[in-house]
């Protein structure tokens, strides 16, 4: 632990002015793991003037950083690049004359205290005023800056010409697009100082490329993947004072796929589990031994989990018997296509026959009751309540 500091497994605090520290505290190799440090408290360190780019990077778990009553004059732009967990920063009563928002733009800070610093009135610190106004909380800090006449001006009163927040405007066509197709988004930004423009595409899977000038840009997304449905795409304008963004949500339409269909499992009810992907929401239909399966209160489709364009559910069967043994086919369709999968289900052996035996399917005379197709999520029973073994003959003819 550096001289003038004390260290524990999770904290470093340096408050002893003598002899004091001249550089940001660093832990010796083979001492405490810097990744476990969550708080650094520095006070009364008049000779600590700079936080360099690599000073803080080892403390990736850092949540609270306090440097008060010290000589801090300069913070490198990328000083906190690796410290994504930082929530509280307190730089009260230091020697900061300027501070860029670039230090903090990637952080989700809940507190930034800058009271008692001799800021110079310029567009460079206008972002602090904007931040204060955005917070509009009762405990607003009393911040001041020195104007050209070396007069202290409340930051709240600071007026600087040609120094304002930028704006972003995203001109998007209908952002509902079919899988495999391509789309181009256009964005224009404005502001003074002239903002930079960039695209925030998050974890977009589809191939994309952008062309960006200072105030105009386009984003071309090609061979759009169904995995990108529901994702947000943002155009961001950024200058010294702050940023603005305009966002759109991408909706990708694609044909259904039955990604999972398994043999029945028994829990509270018997369940033939399935997973279907598709957008728009696919309609489902079950077939039993090649004939439309009549859903009733004894046998019906239940969707248990919907994850955007993925649906997990069961064909739920109440007390099935040997009469329900056979081939179950699930068909899913929407306007973009269809998919079908089949499984064989064996619920129970024939009475008087060893369960391991494999008799032919029962030679039942089926009556043509039929069922309405299921749009996912609609498990309404549209038929009369009839035994769960009733199905429709393959051709739909009555016997």
């Amino acid at each position: 632990c550096p001289t003038s500091c004390k260290c524990s497994a999770s904290r470093i605090w340096c408050s002893d002015p003598s002899p004091g520290i001249v550089a940001f505290p660093r832990l010796e190799p083979n001492s405490v793991d810097p990744e476990n440090i969550t708080e650094i408290f520095i006070a009364n360190q008049k000779r600590l003037e700079i936080i360099n780019e690599d000073d803080v990077e080892a403390y990736v778990g850092l949540r609270n950083l306090t440097i008060v009553d010290s000589g801090l004059k300069f913070v490198a732009h990328k000083a906190f690049l690796k410290n994504s967990n930082l929530q509280h920063i307190n730089f009260t009563r230091n020697k900061l004359t300027s501070l860029s928002r670039k230090h903090f733009r990637h952080l989700d800070l809940s507190e930034l205290i800058l009271v008692g610093n001799p800021f110079t009135c310029s567009c460079d610190i206008m972002w602090i005023k904007t931040l204060q106004e955005a917070k509009s909380s009762p405990d607003t800090q009393d911040l001041y800056c020195l104007n050209e006449s070396s007069k202290n001006i409340p930051l709240a009163n600071l007026q600087i010409p040609n120094c304002g927040l930028p704006s972003a405007n995203l001109a998007a066509p209908n952002l509902t697009v079919e899988e495999g197709k391509s789309i181009t988004l256009s964005c224009s930004v404005a502001g003074d100082p002239v903002p930079n423009m960039y695209w925030d595409v998050g974890n977009l899977v589809s191939k994309h490329m952008n062309e960006t000038s200072h105030t105009q840009g386009s984003l071309r997304i090609t061979n759009i993947s169904s995995d990108d449905s529901g994702k947000q795409i943002s155009c961001v304008a950024e200058n010294l004072v702050g940023e603005d963004q305009d966002s759109v949500n991408l909706t990708v339409h694609f044909a259904p796929t039955i990604t999972f269909l398994e043999s029945p499992t028994s829990d509270h009810h018997w369940c033939i589990p399935f997973t279907v992907k598709g957008n728009p929401k696919p309609a489902l239909q079950w077939f039993y031994n090649g004939a439309i399966l009549n859903e009733s209160k004894y046998i019906c489709t239940k969707i248990h989990v919907t994850n955007h364009t993925e649906y997990h559910g069961c064909l739920q069967l109440d007390n099935p018997t040997h009469m329900n043994n056979g081939d179950y086919t699930l068909i899913a369709k929407n306007e973009y296509g269809k998919d079908e999968k089949q499984i064989s289900a064996h619920f129970m052996g024939w009475p008087g026959i060893d369960d391991g035996a494999n008799p032919n399917y029962p030679d039942v005379i089926y009556e043509d009751y039929g069922t309405a197709a299921n749009d996912i999520g609609d498990t309404t029973n549209r038929s009369n309540e009839i035994p769960s073994t009733d199905v429709t003959d393959k051709t739909g003819r009555e016997h």
Partner: antibody, heavy 119, light 107 residues
Framework: DVQLVESGGGLVQPGGSRKLSCAAS????????MHWVRQAPEKGLEWVAY????????YYADTVKGRFTISRDNPKNTLFLQMTSLRSEDTALYYC????????????WGQGTSVTVSS | DVQITQSPSYLAASPGETITINCRAS??????LAWYQEKPGKTNKLLIY???TLQSGIPSRFSGSGSGTDFTLTISSLEPEDFAMYYC?????????FGAGTKLELK
């Protein structure tokens, strides 16, 4: 036996309206999706519209979207096609057909009803 | 929309012969192609669906093959009642689309 019988065709003026019906028998109508398909004189088949068994989902061909409406009355075993703003190019023999396997392969067809749009 | 190109548009054959009719889709339609027979005074008849599944009640001399974009209807050992108009139809996605038809005539 499965039977589909269309009716309601006839001569209509351009811009006029007509409602076609399809009476179904010999199967449980409420269990099956239904389609309308048309065939212009000396031309091939053109799909027009589809409705699921419970009327949850409906699709139309672009050529009729906004002008035609497909509907059904399950208790009465009847399929309908309401046609408005009719054009000369809508002149055709209109068939109703059944979606037998939920796969949009049309396993039973009616004989068709003729619609002529002319002034 | 999926375009369906059907060939030939006209075919003359004799009873007992084997003939093939082809349909090509403008993009993949998986296995979802159906074949129909149209005869004057009769309702259209579904012969094959899902590329190769024979519709109930259709004689086994009718068979279908293919997947993706290329499909074939084969009628082996032609019978006199087979001379008719034949259409293919993609039933993978909406709008459903048909081929222009093949007229099978007696040579």
């Amino acid at each position: 036996d499965v039977q589909l019988v269309e009716s309601g065709g006839g001569l209509v003026q351009p811009g006029g309206s007509r409602k076609l019906s399809c009476a179904a028998s010999g199967f449980t109508f409420s269990s099956f999706g239904m389609h309308w398909v048309r065939q212009a004189p000396e031309k091939g088949l053109e799909w027009v519209a589809y409705i699921t068994s419970g009327s949850n989902t409906i699709y139309y061909a672009d050529t009729v979207k906004g002008r035609f409406t497909i509907s059904r009355d399950n208790p009465k075993n009847t399929l309908f096609l309401q046609m408005t703003s009719l054009r000369s190019e809508d002149t055709a023999l209109y068939y109703c057909a059944r979606d037998g396997y939920f796969l949009d392969a049309l396993d039973y067809w009616g004989q068709g009803t003729s619609v002529t749009v002319s002034s | 929309d999926v375009q369906i190109t059907q060939s030939p548009s006209y075919l003359a054959a004799s009873p007992g012969e084997t003939i093939t009719i082809n349909c090509r889709a403008s993009k993949s339609i998986s296995k979802y192609l159906a074949w129909y027979q149209e005869k004057p005074g009769k309702t259209n008849k579904l012969l094959i669906y899902s590329g190769s599944t024979l519709q109930s009640g259709i004689p086994s001399r009718f068979s279908g093959s293919g997947s993706g974009t290329d499909f074939t209807l084969t009628i082996s050992s032609l019978e006199p009642e087979d001379f008719a108009m034949y259409y293919c139809q993609q039933h993978n996605e909406f709008p459903l689309t048909f081929g222009a038809g093949t007229k099978l005539e007696l040579k």
